[in-house]
Amino acid sequence: AGVFELQIHSFGPGPGPGAPRSPCSARLPCRLFFRVCLKPGLSEEAAESPCALGAALSARGPVYTEQPGAPAPDLPLPDGLLQVPFRDAWPGTFSFIIETWREELGDQIGGPAWSLLARVAGRRRLAAGGPWARDIQRAGAWELRFSYRARCEPPAVGTACTRLCRPRSAPSRCGPGLRPCAPLEDECEAPLVCRAGCSPEHGFCEQPGECRCLEGWTGPLCTVPVSTSSCLSPRGPSSATTGCLVPGPGPCDGNPCANGGSCSETPRSFECTCPRGFYGLRCEVSGVTCADGPCFNGGLCVGGADPDSAYICHCPPGFQGSNCEKRVDRCSLQPCRNGGLCLDLGHALRCRCRAGFAGPRCEHDLDDCAGRACANGGTCVEGGGAHRCSCALGFGGRDCRERADPCAARPCAHGGRCYAHFSGLVCACAPGYMGARCEFPVHPDGASALPAAPPGLRPGDPQRYL
């Protein structure tokens, strides 16, 4: 057993051009906190896979407000270490994910809002009990500097925290065959309690008579390396010569225990011994409680009053994931108009508009008529990012500078003759028709169908169209 410790030294803009904007502002003050997730081995695992070695959340850092005009400095950090306790042997090789979270303290409805600023990941070899290891990781334009170490909790010692130490029974020296416990020279190695023959390098025990293997080793005494090559022999016992493990059928086949739990066979089935922080038949339930604040983005934590009862995060609309840490892709509904680019900022959707458009959803055409005149009394009409002129009667062209022939479109109906006039056009109607465009037939009794002729005008008189 032991503790992995992480010390964050700084989080701020990395070197080089393109310094990030400060995540906080006078309008939206914020503070940072960190989350670390540890997994055994060097395998590339998805960020969502379980933190089998454990996880920890830091305290919140001091509130920070950006100084107007100043570049983003190194941001104020939470006090103290992030500590991830591990119950079993330290694996020696591990993968880590360190996330930097921002807590916005503006006037959000329903309390503060959280958003992920940066996530770094890596794979490292580390012996327990060694000195602090320093590291620098970059995520986009941000840079995270940190140190880490693994230390054993007494009575465990050694690079994997698998050797046990006990206080000396005699002040001068350790008992026969027992060495002093470095670096605790005043303590001695405990008598060997593992199964006889259990490999001192690749095996360990926590109970008398057992022999549990470190990653990469197998066999009853942990002397057989697990082969990565395919096994050609039929199903049966493992071969110590080839190092090829061919498991026999059994309830612990494939290790049904999740999250780093160890499986042991029982007369009827199997039993999982779970690492700290997990429980359940297969160690599938996390022992984090609601008091640890596991639900992000305003998620409501239910249950989990103590480590022996599960918690569930009820996520607010727009968030998902077991800890409400993932945002639903609201931009997939394509709310931005006119080809605008959608950005989900968390607290709001933003649209980056194409040239010629503006507004929260790019719904407004910019006034392309600004500074553009339409001649001869024409009116400018905006649309589609370009302007056009609606010209007064008798004029045409892009800017209404061309004199138009009002008769070109043959506006007079029923064979009426068109005459251009300084203020428009005049139709001389054929017999039997009347109206500005000769559109109305005249009935035989002299009454017009629609409408009545204006006073002073007889059917057949030219009428000016205004």
Partner: nanobody, 120 residues
């Protein structure tokens, strides 16, 4: 405040049909975009179908030809007609709307969800 109220969910056999409705009410000046998302058990929420800000109709690849989205502007309501339903369509279906409020601000709203179960 704006409310989105979904209805029409339920249990249906494979190959069957259902029609979901979502009515928006409250201080709505206009609805900019509106549609349906779904979240199958243990998976991410994904867009199923919607009317975009440009009033185009969009569909997830997996539902094209089987689902049809329609709307009644006068009632601020969208519908999702689901036919030839499959087991993998089982999910909670959420209505979503990008709304312009009387204040002229835009806000994105979610309904509470309606469960659709497809099983023999």
């Amino acid at each position: 405040e704006v409310q989105l109220v979904e209805s029409g969910g339920g249990e249906v056999q494979p190959g069957g049909s259902l029609r979901l409705s979502c009515a928006a009410s409250g201080s709505i000046l206009s609805i900019n975009a509106m549609g349906w998302y779904r979240q199958p058990p243990g998976k991410q929420r994904e867009l199923v179908a919607g009317f975009t800000g440009d009033t185009n109709t969009i569909y997830a690849e997996s539902v094209k030809g089987r689902f049809t989205i329609s709307r009644d502007n006068a009632k601020n309501t969208v519908y999702l007609q689901m036919s030839s339903l499959r087991a993998e369509d089982t999910a909670v279906y959420y209505c979503a709307a990008d709304v312009q409020l009387f204040s002229r601000d835009y806000e994105f709203y979610w309904g509470q969800g309606t469960l659709v179960t497809v099983k023999p």
